[in-house]
Interface confidence: medium
Amino acid sequence: KAMHVAQPAVVLASSRGIASFVCEYASPGKATEVRVTVLRQADSQVTEVCAATYMMGNELTFLDDSICTGTSSGNQVNLTIQGLRAMDTGLYICKVELMYPPPYYLGIGNGTQIYVIDPEPCPDSD
């Protein structure tokens, strides 16, 4: 079944290559297990950036080598993506799945355009 997912249209990464945004879903039921996936769309290619399954009320657990971290509060997921460079600029789509209990729900946001600008190198000081 379909579910609405909201996320900001545009986010500018910090000079350290960190971008944060909120992914909010309109939960039609009382889900206890939720899966959140961040997808990056650039040109016609869609790639999975990171994914985490969490139990409501608990922390999101991404893989150790993931560039994502996050926290959840009710129907909101606060996502942070680190280590971004200019080449990572693109549309980052939040996909939310209510895994348990049934029925299964899927929601896909319209995407957050993340702009990443590589910092200028510091000039050498004499």
């Epitope: 899966r35 769309q41 869609v46 790639t47 799945e97 895994m99 029925p103 299964y104 896909i108």
Partner: nanobody
């Protein structure tokens, strides 16, 4: 640039057959789901069939089950819709559409047909080909 080009439409008598083709360029079918949709004058666009090119899963609307068959040729980057036993109510403009598999349910088959046959699930669309079933 992603492009989908439909062909194979035309005028056919009731009970006849047609094979529609959807040629994709700008991406490979391997990771995409391709759906066929149709829109009759004054009606909403409705899902007809879909094939998930990553695992070959197929989905059909109840109105065409047993009459239409969807298939793919990854080497030609083309998806086909074989339409048999055509009826006047099959008259419509037929469109093919594509969406990356990652943007569909993680659990394949779990409510799958609902998403695969929803027009709003798809990102890329062709221009359409007219199918007219009339005697």
């Amino acid at each position: 640039e992603v492009q989908l080009v439909e062909s194979g439409g035309g005028l056919v008598q009731p009970g006849g057959s047609l094979r529609l083709s959807c040629a994709a360029s700008g991406f490979t079918l391997d990771y995409y789901a391709i759906g066929w949709f149709r829109q009759a004058p004054g009606k909403e666009r409705e899902g007809v069939s879909c094939i998930d090119s990553s695992d070959g899963s197929t989905y059909y609307a109840d109105s065409v089950k047993g009459r239409f068959t969807i298939s793919r040729d990854n080497a030609k980057n083309t998806v086909y819709l074989q339409m048999n036993s055509l009826k006047p109510e099959d008259t419509a403009v037929y469109y093919c559409a594509a969406v990356h598999g990652l943007k569909l349910p993680t659990l394949r088959g779990l409510g799958g047909s609902y998403y695969y046959l929803q027009a709003r699930s798809y990102d890329y669309w062709g221009q359409g080909t007219q199918v007219t079933v009339s005697s």
